[in-house]
């Protein structure tokens, strides 16, 4: 059982544990999300992503979650259960990112660019909200990310 993001294979990640970690904090996160009209991981970001694109996109999205979302939210929360869940998610995201090596070859430029444009849509939506709201919404949308990642899961 592994993820196949196009040519990028990821082993050793157990999706069940990611879901368990997310569900442990889901109600808290989504209850704190007051801006229900907006969505960060909108349709245009995740719809019809090709296998070739998927490696670039998941790499940039998970790196953003690690460097911006988990890192900042970690400093804002004190509840042990919440911290434990975020640690589980973050550790698994690190494991995924560490195994992703998107090709930097010139012939992949258009695919890389397409994935980057998708990521920019997500980042733009994130930056339009104030920091607290953006972090909360991003964490509340981890289920959207995990559901999309299922498309690249192999039994």
């Amino acid at each position: 059982q592994e993820f196949h993001f196009g040519p990028c294979q990821v082993k050793g990640v157990v999706p069940q544990k990611l879901w368990e970690a997310f569900w442990a904090v889901k109600d808290t996160m989504q209850a704190q999300d007051n801006i229900t009209s907006a969505r960060l991981l909108q349709q245009e970001v995740l719809q019809n992503v090709s296998d070739a694109e998927s490696c670039y996109l998941v790499h940039t999205l998970l790196e953003f979650y690690l460097k911006t979302v988990f890192k900042n939210y970690h400093n804002r929360t004190v509840e042990v259960r919440t911290l434990k869940s975020f640690s589980t998610l973050a550790n698994n995201f690190v494991l995924i990112v560490s195994q992703l090596q998107p090709s930097q070859e010139n012939e992949m430029f258009s695919i890389r660019d397409s994935a980057h444009r998708r990521f920019l849509l997500f980042r733009r939506a994130f930056k339009q909200l104030d920091v607290e709201a953006a972090l909360t919404k991003a964490l509340g949308e981890v289920d959207i990310l995990l559901t999309w990642m299922q498309k690249f899961y192999k039994l």
Epitope: Q1, W19, E20, L146, T147, Y153
Partner: antibody, heavy 119, light 106 residues
Framework: EVQLVESGGALVQPGGSLRLSCAAS????????MSWVRQAPGKGLEWVSH????????FYAESMKGRATISRDNAKNTLYLQMNSLKSEDTAVYYC????????????WGQGTQVTVSS | SYELTQSPSVSVALRQTAKITCGGD??????VQWYQQKPGQAPVLVIY???RRPSGIPERFSGSNSGNTATLTSSGTQAEDEADYYC?????????FGGGTHLTVL
């Protein structure tokens, strides 16, 4: 080899209660989320409930909220569905299913147990 | 709540191609599973994650998913493919099944 064996189905009167069991083998039970799915006579599949591998997270279909409780005993490799205030529309074959992703990827199913609610 | 729409029945001539569709709002962003069920039997997973085939499922079964429609295709349909087929997704902590399509092989 993955095996799921349901039991506990019976004929019960409206308003009655029933506890279904699903004995699992062939995989590390507590690593996987599990679900109950039912099928009324001549009808389609209807998801009933879901429980995470650690048992901490549970979800229910609207039709069963407040009347059903899903649980698991990881030491016994067994999944349960406690149903109360049963109605005639709960008559169905109840299947337990192993979730291979954690959010509705049912690669393995039991053979089902028949629940009939009738006076 | 999320809904999936399937046409109740599809007919196909033996060894021809059958297409069964599943409609849902922005289903293309969700991961779609397809199950085959024969009378008196439990469902069997035939396609998962839109287009992946579990081991043991014949190569004639394939899947696609884009926009508001997911499609299960049986190329060179065999008599034993006659069954009910259900699409399924996960949405907001709920598993959702389509109403089912009965495939008749003529």
């Amino acid at each position: 080899e993955v095996q799921l064996v349901e039991s506990g189905g019976a004929l019960v009167q409206p308003g009655g209660s029933l506890r279904l069991s699903c004995a699992a083998s062939g995989f590390t039970f507590d690593d996987y989320a599990m679900s109950w799915v039912r099928q009324a006579p001549g009808k389609g599949l209807e998801w009933v409930s879901h429980i995470s591998g650690n048992g901490f997270s549970t979800f229910y279909a609207e039709s069963m909220k407040g009347r059903a409780t899903i649980s698991r005993d990881n030491a016994k490799n067994t999944l349960y569905l406690q149903m109360n205030s049963l109605k005639s529309e709960d008559t169905a074959v109840y299947y337990c299913a192993k979730d291979d992703y954690g959010s509705g990827l049912y690669a393995y199913w039991g053979q089902g147990t028949q629940v009939t609610v009738s006076s | 709540s999320y809904e999936l729409t399937q046409s109740p029945s599809v007919s196909v001539a033996l060894r021809q191609t059958a297409k069964i569709t599943c409609g849902g709002d922005n289903i293309g962003s969700k991961s779609v599973q397809w199950y085959q069920q024969k009378p008196g039997q439990a469902p069997v997973l035939v396609i998962y994650a839109d287009s992946r085939r579990p081991s043991g499922i014949p190569e004639r079964f394939s899947g696609s998913n884009s926009g508001n429609t997911a499609t299960l295709t049986s190329s060179g349909t065999q008599a034993e493919d006659e069954a009910d087929y259900y699409c399924q997704v996960w949405d907001s902590s709920v598993a959702v099944f389509g109403g089912g399509t009965h495939l008749t092989v003529l």
